[in-house]
Interface confidence: medium
């Protein structure tokens, strides 16, 4: 299953990055799971994961660093709390969980660049 | 003449970006000219230019936004005062001016990403 996501995104100076993950659904899925993975130096880490029923809101874990909304086959993902050391390739993985058959799609990744802000001068 | 430069550089939160421009000199040039060009939306603009004698410092114009140092066939370039809207492809152009023959090399460009910092809160 094909998954599309932008090649490059810049995090804001507040450490927030948003991108769209779009999948070409071969069937009429009602339950979809979206996972964001970070790949850097050949190491892959899960950033966050959410399950949603088509037409409903994404449900992330209770203290996820991601938020998101869904619209049809598009998922708008926002990652918060990013630091310069988090610069890397963020891969969108989409699973069509229900009804069968199960489908899996993995995007090529979005390179997210993060720059730490300069500290503000002390106010004396 | 081959010119190498990094594919991507992030400007610091102070709007400063540095990268190395390296050229494969076919001869023993004594006078070299380095020009930085910015390409965005198919429009090319000169950012700065410097001429230097091998073994000496680069001489930019006195109000140039660039500074740099040279070491052999490598030029270390720094561009200052960058804003988010300056994000673009920065191309290094190297000309071997003297002695003849004249050689020209153009790099593939360095994509410089710039994020404007958040304003600091007012100190009351």
């Amino acid at each position: 299953m094909h998954v599309a996501q932008p090649a490059v995104v810049l995090a804001s100076s507040r450490g927030i990055a948003s991108f769209v993950c779009e999948y070409a659904s071969p069937g009429k899925a009602t339950e979809v799971r979206v996972t964001v993975l970070r790949q850097a130096d050949s190491q892959v880490t899960e950033v966050c994961a959410a399950t949603y029923m088509m037409g409903n809101e994404l449900t992330f874990l209770d203290d996820s660093i991601c938020t998101g909304t869904s619209s049809g086959n598009q998922v708008n993902l926002t990652i918060q709390g990013l630091r310069a050391m988090d610069t890397g390739l963020y891969i969108c993985k989409v699973e069509l969980m229900y009804p069968p058959p199960y489908y899996l799609g993995i995007g090529n990744g979005t390179q997210i660049y993060v720059i730490d802000p300069e500290p503000c001068p002390d106010s004396d | 003449m081959h010119v190498a430069q990094p594919a991507v550089v992030l400007a610091s939160s102070r709007g400063i970006a540095s990268f190395v421009c390296e050229y494969a000199s076919p001869g023993k040039a004594t006078e070299v000219r380095v020009t930085v060009l910015r390409q965005a939306d198919s429009q090319v603009t000169e950012v700065c230019a410097a001429t230097y004698m091998m073994g000496n410092e680069l001489t930019f114009l006195d109000d140039s936004i660039c500074t740099g140092t040279s070491s052999g066939n490598q030029v270390n370039l720094t561009i200052q005062g960058l804003r988010a809207m300056d994000t673009g492809l920065y191309i290094c152009k190297v000309e071997l001016m003297y002695p003849p023959p004249y050689y020209l090399g153009i790099g593939n460009g360095t994509q410089i990403y710039v994020i404007d910092p958040e304003p600091c809160p007012d100190s009351d």
Partner: nanobody
Framework: QVQLQESGGGSVQAGGSLKLSCAAS???????????MGWFRQTPGKERERVAT???????IYADSVKGRFTISKDNVKNTLYLQMNSLKPEDTAMYYC?????????????????WGQGTQVTVSS
């Protein structure tokens, strides 16, 4: 391989305090700094329950029963997770486990955590 080792458990009177520590090894600095970590507890015959978790950005979540009494903290230099337990009650008696996820985000479900310590016993008497 990631390994977690708890310490600091013991017996204490109700109203007393204990500080649990969990030393992590097998991590790169970056992976430790960004991994969700937490404390769970279990009493015989009951399911493991979340006590407190801390995610990559330092956001913490506590079980309702420990809010205001327990504090979770993470030392990214020493690669150590702590749980400061104050105003202990007899119902806090349990085996306390340190846990980690291969994720920046946490979960209340113990099954989502892939790495576990051996546990340290906390006993609170009235």
């Amino acid at each position: 391989q990631v390994q977690l080792q708890e310490s600091g458990g013991g017996s204490v009177q109700a109203g007393g305090s204990l500080k649990l520590s969990c030393a992590a090894s097998g991590y790169t600095d970056y992976t430790y700094n960004t991994s969700c970590m937490g404390w769970f507890r279990q009493t015989p015959g009951k399911e493991r329950e979340r006590v407190a978790t801390v995610n990559k950005v330092g956001s913490t979540i506590y079980a309702d029963s420990v809010k205001g009494r327990f504090t979770i903290s993470k030392d990214n230099v020493k690669n150590t997770l702590y749980l400061q337990m104050n105003s202990l009650k007899p119902e806090d008696t349990a085996m306390y486990y340190c846990a980690a996820r291969g994720s920046w985000s946490c979960s209340q479900f113990w099954g989502d955590f892939g790495y576990w310590g051996q546990g340290t016993q906390v006993t609170v008497s009235s």
